[in-house]
């Protein structure tokens, strides 16, 4: 369809109907319409209609397909990482050491300068490097608010391996509440705990904690303490953005 | 490109070259290369490198763009749906009643009859409709095992609503086991319990249970009581499939 | 599925992923980008040869649906399917940048 | 996007999703589908106007990559992007079957 | 390759009965419809009626010419289909044959057919 | 019950020719009619199935058209292996019933 020829709609639209008739019956194995001599009389039966209903239901609520990515994600993201708070800093004393948890603090201003509005993170992760696990572990990810209550983001199973592994996690909501607030943020990283708890020890070792004792948060282990990495638009191309929003 | 002219590669290959030079570019909002005047002398700096393949590294880990669909997933599926087996019978006996749990079975040989080989299967949700509900809730779906154990499945957020609504999972790879195994098999819906662990009351309502006491399992509303929504390659589809497998 | 498996190691006329390594210095002339050196961007190309409305052939068209015109179009092009971002290193003036691009290497196609 | 929030509601010439509603028993002389009578098929169509070497228009050419060549193909083609499914309801002899048929609606289009 | 083979055909007296048998092979037989079309001499082909598949639960439907004096059957294990007639006249004299239905509403594949004749 | 009416029995041609052999539906019937071949010696086969889809090994010969109650069979080229008999039938709707035939002939 170059720009110089004009362009038949309706032959377009009627090529389109026949694609549709092949490939309706393409998709289910017909090589022709079923014929309709058998079909009883009278409505389709409830049970029918309901699980019809059930599957388009289904479509509305969930697409079936990915989102297309939206303009700004067309254009190249700066990557930075911030590492997380050494543990000697003061915030991790308010923290119990306890037996199914791991904290990690973040630096905001760090964050900031890295993304300078919360409008450009585009994406950001919690990378962990755990260490060689003899068995699998459900664990979660706990994000901190100054009342020092934690919300509920992610579980995860931990396989059982011989190799140390990265672990990552999609923190993107909670780094960009962040952007906008305190001056220290942290994770929490628990086993999962049930109901009728029985040993909800974490097992899991988290590259940067010492492997003495869950709680006795030591040394880091040179740069691959846990850290976020971020994907952002840098701000000069932000602004490019904006001025462009206008479609072509 | 049609099949009649005799395709240049090395004209569309200069091309595509082109392209990529002009779509870098534009990716990085630069209207011509960075000068390099200022590029300090020697190695990239260790940290750099070491963004560079975290950076990387996600890449190789989890590709950014979802896999293409298999050449299975073209095909209609059928759906079919499989209801709760109710709960007069004798399965729920064997689970205490709790204030923090309830538990939905399902029987086997019906799922069997909707899909008769496991490699069939393409999809299942569990479908509960979930009654209105004040305060938001996190809660957790586990799958039995034979030996009353529970694996987790999912985690999800409830959030507090004026409707009723409702709520799907994926358990494509419970159902995927249970069509290989046993008679009956069932889901336990819990809410979050945390370590350090207050009221662990499951607060969601969910439509088929009575909602006077938590435990006490007893009318189903009708069709509305928790079902398996299966999508699955009909038999006589899926021999077609396998006898096509040449390419082309 | 048209990726870099099947179609590396066929003679696919139609359709099909086609390899081609990017080298930025020899084939771009640039020398600002310090990592990679250059990457597999690969590209799409071959005819989709849907015949629309031959009803004599009906049973071969529809058996050719899936590869040929998946997507019921008008006139089916080959495009890419799945793609896969690329992080580069440059310097802007003394400072190094990390970027990520997005959708840089295609690694199947498909007729849509 | 080149959705249909943005195409259905302009006059946009280069491509975008095309409103199509196909009526199973007008546009295809089926009775055979029961449910739904018909569904929002759409289409896409129009150029990707990519200059692809023309250097003095190069900063023009580079606004315009997003729209109209983002992936950077030697031969940008109008194609779906984002796609849903559809479920129907037919017989097979008497047996009454509900069926979901992936990529069904085109809901954008994007040169690729 | 898909082959029918219809076998049972011969000379029947007014009011007698007789059972034709179909041999079916090359395909999954549980899954098609099979069907019985008569052709008496000289005529056009009449579809007499048909035993539905395994989904349809091996169903059966005939013609008003038929009802109630023709019985189709089939035995699954040994891929064979059976038209039971009873109560016979001189109209029933035709080459009987067994053919695979499919839900297109056609038949795709023919027996070599087996004649059946009705006189005193 | 649907009539299916051939209103030619017979048909006389010469090898190479091009013939057409005619099929009306006392109603609608959707596009379901299927033609059938039945050689001198009895043998049925199927030709076209849904007006115009030619069944698998059946030559490209032989093409079918037609919609609503009107559908006709198109030999080109005849040979003298179309030698036979042709049969038009309704996938419509129930009981499935067959028109009267067409019988070719060489001149």
């Known amino acids: 369809l170059s720009t110089c020829k004009t362009i038949d709609m309706e032959l377009v639209k009627r090529k389109r109907i026949e694609a549709i008739r092949g490939q309706i019956l393409s998709k289910l194995r017909l090589a022709s319409p079923p014929s309709q001599g058998e079909v009883p009389p009278g409505p389709l039966p409830e049970a029918v209609l309901a699980l019809y209903n059930s599957t388009r239901d289904r479509v509305a609520g969930e697409s079936a397909e990915p989102e297309p990515e939206p303009e700004a994600d067309y254009y190249a993201k700066e990557v930075t990482r911030v590492l997380m708070v050494e543990t000697h800093n003061e915030i991790y004393d308010k923290f119990k050491q306890s037996t199914h948890s791991i904290y990690m603090f973040f630096n905001t201003s760090e964050l900031r300068e890295a993304v300078p509005e919360p409008v450009l993170l585009s994406r950001a992760e919690l990378r962990l490097l755990r260490l060689k696990l003899k068995v699998e572990q459900h664990v979660e990810l706990y994000q901190g608010y100054g009342n020092a209550s934690w919300r509920y983001l992610h579980g995860r199973s931990v396989r059982a391996t011989a190799d140390d592994e990265w672990l990552s996690f999609d923190v993107t909501d909670a780094v960009h509440q962040w952007l906008s607030g305190g001056e220290i943020e942290g994770f929490r990283l628990s086993a999962h705990c049930s109901c009728d708890s029985r040993d909800n020890t974490l097992q899991v070792d988290i590259n940067g904690f010492t492997t003495g004792r869950r709680g006795d948060l030591a040394t880091i282990h040179g740069m691959n303490r846990p850290f976020l990495l971020l994907m952002a638009t840098p701000l000069e191309r932000a602004q490019h953005l904006q001025s462009s929003r206008h479609r072509r | 490109l049609s099949t009649c002219k005799t395709i240049d590669m090395e004209l569309v290959k200069r091309k595509r070259i082109e392209a990529i030079r002009g779509q870098i570019l534009s990716k990085l909002r630069l209207a011509s290369p960075p000068s390099q005047g200022e590029v300090p002398p020697g190695p990239l700096p260790e940290a750099v490198l070491a963004l560079y393949n975290s950076t990387r590294d996600r890449v190789a880990g989890e590709s950014a763009e979802p896999e293409p669909e298999p050449e299975a997933d073209y095909y209609a599926k059928e759906v079919t749906r499989v209801l709760m087996v109710e709960t007069h019978n004798e399965i729920y006996d064997k689970f205490k009643q709790s204030t923090h749990s309830i538990y939905m079975f399902f029987n086997t040989s019906e799922l069997r009859e909707a899909v008769p080989e496991p490699v069939l299967l393409s999809r299942a949700e569990l479908r509960l409709l979930r009654l209105k509900l004040k305060v938001e809730q996190h809660v957790e779906l586990y799958q039995g095992y034979g030996n009353a154990s529970w694996r987790y499945l999912h985690g999800r957020s409830v959030r507090a609503t004026a409707d009723d609504e409702w709520l799907s999972f994926d358990v494509t790879d419970a159902v995927h086991q249970w069509l290989s195994g046993g008679e009956i098999e069932g889901f336990r819906l819990s809410a979050h319990c945390s370590c350090d662990s207050r009221d662990n009351t499951l607060q969601v309502d969910i439509n088929g249970f009575t909602t006077g006491r938590r435990g006490d399992l007893a009318t189903i509303h009708g069709m509305n009581r928790p079902f398996l929504l299966l999508m699955a390659t009909p038999l006589e589809r899926a021999q077609h499939l396998q006898s096509s497998r040449h390419r082309r | 599925a048209l990726d870099t498996n099947y179609c590396f190691s066929s003679t696919e006329k139609n359709c099909c992923v086609r390899q081609l390594y990017i080298d930025f210095r020899k084939d771009l002339g640039w020398k600002w980008i310090h990592e990679p050196k250059g990457y597999h961007a690969n590209f799409c190309l071959g005819p989709c040869p849907y015949i629309w409305s031959l009803d004599t052939q009906y049973s071969k068209v529809l058996a050719l649906y899936n590869q040929h015109n998946p997507g019921a179009s008008a006139a089916p092009c080959c495009v890419p399917q799945a793609l896969e971002p690329l992080p580069i290193v440059y310097y802007v003036g003394r400072k190094p940048k990390v970027e990520q691009l997005s959708n840089m290497i295609v690694r199947s196609c498909k007729c849509s | 996007a080149l959705d249909t929030n943005y195409c259905f509601s302009s006059t946009e010439k280069n491509c975008c999703v095309r409103q199509l509603y196909i009526d199973f028993r007008k546009d295809l002389g089926w009775k055979w589908i029961h449910e739904p009578k018909g569904y929002h098929a759409n289409f896409c169509l129009g150029p990707c106007p990519y200059i692809w070497s023309l250097d003095t228009q190069y900063s023009k050419v580079l606004a315009l990559y997003n729209q109209h060549n983002p992936g950077a193909s030697a031969a940008p083609c109008c194609v779906p992007q984002a796609l849903e499914p559809l479920p129907i309801v037919y017989y097979v002899g008497r047996k009454p079957k509900v069926e979901q048929l992936s990529n069904m609606i085109v809901r954008s289009c994007k040169c690729s | 390759e898909v082959k029918l083979v219809e076998s049972g055909g011969g000379l029947v007296q007014p009011g007698g009965s007789l059972s034709l048998s179909c041999a079916a092979s090359?395909?999954?037989?549980?899954?098609?419809?099979m069907s019985w079309v008569r052709q008496p001499p000289g005529k056009a082909l009449e579809w007499l009626g048909f035993?539905?598949?395994?989904?349809?639960?091996?169903?059966?439907e005939y013609s008003a010419s038929v009802k109630g004096r023709f019985t189709i059957s089939r035995d699954n294990s040994q891929s064979i289909l059976y038209l039971q007639m009873n109560v016979l006249r001189a109209e029933d004299s035709a080459t009987y044959y067994c053919?695979?239905?499919?839900?297109?509403?056609?038949?795709?594949?023919w027996g070599q057919g087996t004649t059946l004749t009705v006189s005193s | 019950d649907i009539q299916m009416t051939q209103t030619t029995s017979s048909l006389s041609a010469s090898l190479g020719d091009r013939l057409t052999i005619s099929c009306r539906a006392s109603?609608?019937?959707?596009?379901?009619l299927n033609w059938y071949q039945q050689k001198p010696d009895g043998t049925v086969k199927l030709l076209i199935y849904?007006?115009?889809r030619l069944h698998s090994g059946v030559p490209s010969r032989f093409s079918g058209s037609g919609s609503g109650t009107d559908y006709s069979l198109t030999i080109s080229n005849l040979e003298q292996a179309d030698i036979a008999t042709y049969f038009c039938?309704?996938?419509?709707?129930?009981?499935?019933?067959f028109g009267g035939g067409t019988k070719l002939e060489i001149k």
């Open positions: 109603q609608d019937i959707s596009n379901y």
């Open positions: 039938q309704q996938g419509d709707t129930l009981p499935w019933t």
């Open positions: 053919a695979r239905y499919t839900g297109g509403g056609y038949f795709d594949y």
């Open positions: 035993i539905r598949n395994k989904p349809n639960g091996y169903t059966t």
């Open positions: 090359g395909f999954t037989f549980t899954d098609y419809y």
């Open positions: 849904y007006t115009s």
